[in-house]
């Protein structure tokens, strides 16, 4: 969490941003909030990016003002116009690109004053893993698959029964480049699986950590998966 204050001229207002991550090819949100104003026409929002000459986005007098918008963001940005009046200056970024990563500034002017805060935005690819029993294999085998990751993640297997065990000798992980030549499909196979146990396939890079669990008993198979972004710090 980054909290910034305005300085010179008028009074300062508090602006708060939260570091976040974008999943390339999907839409992302750059979060920013500020002390609200009662008049929308008095609010100016500017988003800037370090190393980019034009503005990322500008909103003033109740509407977008994109005459100075940088080419790399053209047609890809929007604020939540109906929420600006309550202090939400968050930016929606469409079709996140790897090159969108970097340091952004949310700069606000209201009738109360000015303020700004920076935000670190990471980009990559992350997806939920799915763990299945591989019935084609000669021994009891689990197969963990996740369709899109970047940068290349690490994959670690764990088991509820054999806590602390190292499964690297009985597992094999491969990374297959997807058609857009950036993200990769992750496939990890775990051999010599025992029944009545819960296994976890953990995939992690510097942006996200995802876990796929599978519980195999003689009568049923239960699956669960979850994904956590690693860098959500507020400023």
């Amino acid at each position: 969490l980054i909290i910034g204050f305005g300085i010179s001229g008028r009074h300062s207002i508090t602006v708060t941003t939260v570091a976040s991550a974008g999943n390339i090819g999907e839409d992302g949100i750059l979060s920013c909030t500020f002390e609200p104003d009662i008049k929308l026409s008095d609010i100016v929002i500017q988003w800037l990016k370090e190393g980019v000459l034009g503005l990322v986005h500008e909103f003033k007098e109740g509407k977008d003002e994109l005459s100075e918008q940088d080419e790399m963001f053209r047609g890809r940005t929007a604020v939540f116009a109906d929420q600006v009046i309550v202090g939400n200056a968050s930016l929606r970024l469409k079709n996140v690109q790897l090159t969108d990563a970097g340091t952004y500034k949310c700069y606000i002017i209201t009738s109360k004053g000015k303020g700004n805060a920076n935000l670190e935005y990471k980009t990559g690819a992350f997806s939920m893993p799915e763990v299945n029993v591989d019935y084609n294999a000669s021994s009891e085998t689990l197969r963990c698959e996740a369709p899109r990751w970047f940068p290349q993640p690490t994959v670690v297997w764990a088991s509820q029964v054999d806590q602390g065990a190292n499964f690297s000798e009985v597992s094999n992980t491969s990374f297959e480049l997807n058609s857009e030549n950036v993200t990769m499909k992750v496939v990890s196979v775990l051999y010599n699986v025992t029944i009545n146990n819960t296994y976890s396939c953990m995939i992690e890079n510097d942006i996200a950590k995802a876990t796929g669990d599978i519980k195999v008993t003689e009568s049923e198979i239960k699956r669960r998966s979850h994904l956590q972004l690693l860098n959500s710090k507020a400023s």
């Epitope: 190393g51 340091t103 700004n116």
Partner: nanobody, 122 residues
Framework: EVQLVESGGGLVQPGGSLRLSCAAS????????MHWARQVPGKGREWISR????????SYADSVKGRFTISRDNAKNMVYLQMNNLRAEDTAVYYC???????????????WGQGTTVTVSS
């Protein structure tokens, strides 16, 4: 106050070279990315190149890639644009600009120099 003064423009033949310079003052030069852009009369400004404060990162528009080189000298508060193999379509007013991103940024801040004219003609 940010001040940027470009120089080095002139008339050059197709295939020729020019080196543009930009003298910066009024801010902590080495902390900022610097940019070059150009404008043909009647058209919008076109960004062409940028360089990070430590010179470790540079990038170029496709239209100038392989022909133009950006550099800087933080001791002298100078940024340069070496232009080789110039073409008629490179004719424009060339502007040096400071990155907006910084603690001193304010609404309406002028980050541009006044420009220097480059004419490529035989």
């Amino acid at each position: 106050e940010v001040q940027l003064v470009e120089s080095g423009g002139g008339l050059v033949q197709p295939g020729g070279s020019l080196r543009l310079s930009c003298a910066a003052s009024g801010f902590a030069f080495s902390n900022y990315w610097m940019h070059w852009a150009r404008q043909v009369p009647g058209k919008g400004r076109e960004w062409i190149s940028r360089i990070s404060g430590d010179s470790e990162s540079t990038s170029y528009a496709d239209s100038v890639k392989g022909r133009f080189t950006i550099s800087r000298d933080n001791a002298k508060n100078m940024v340069y644009l070496q232009m080789n193999n110039l073409r008629a379509e490179d004719t424009a007013v060339y502007y040096c600009a400071r990155d907006r991103f910084g603690d001193d940024y304010y609404y309406g801040m002028n980050v541009w120099g006044q420009g220097t004219t480059v004419t490529v003609s035989s």
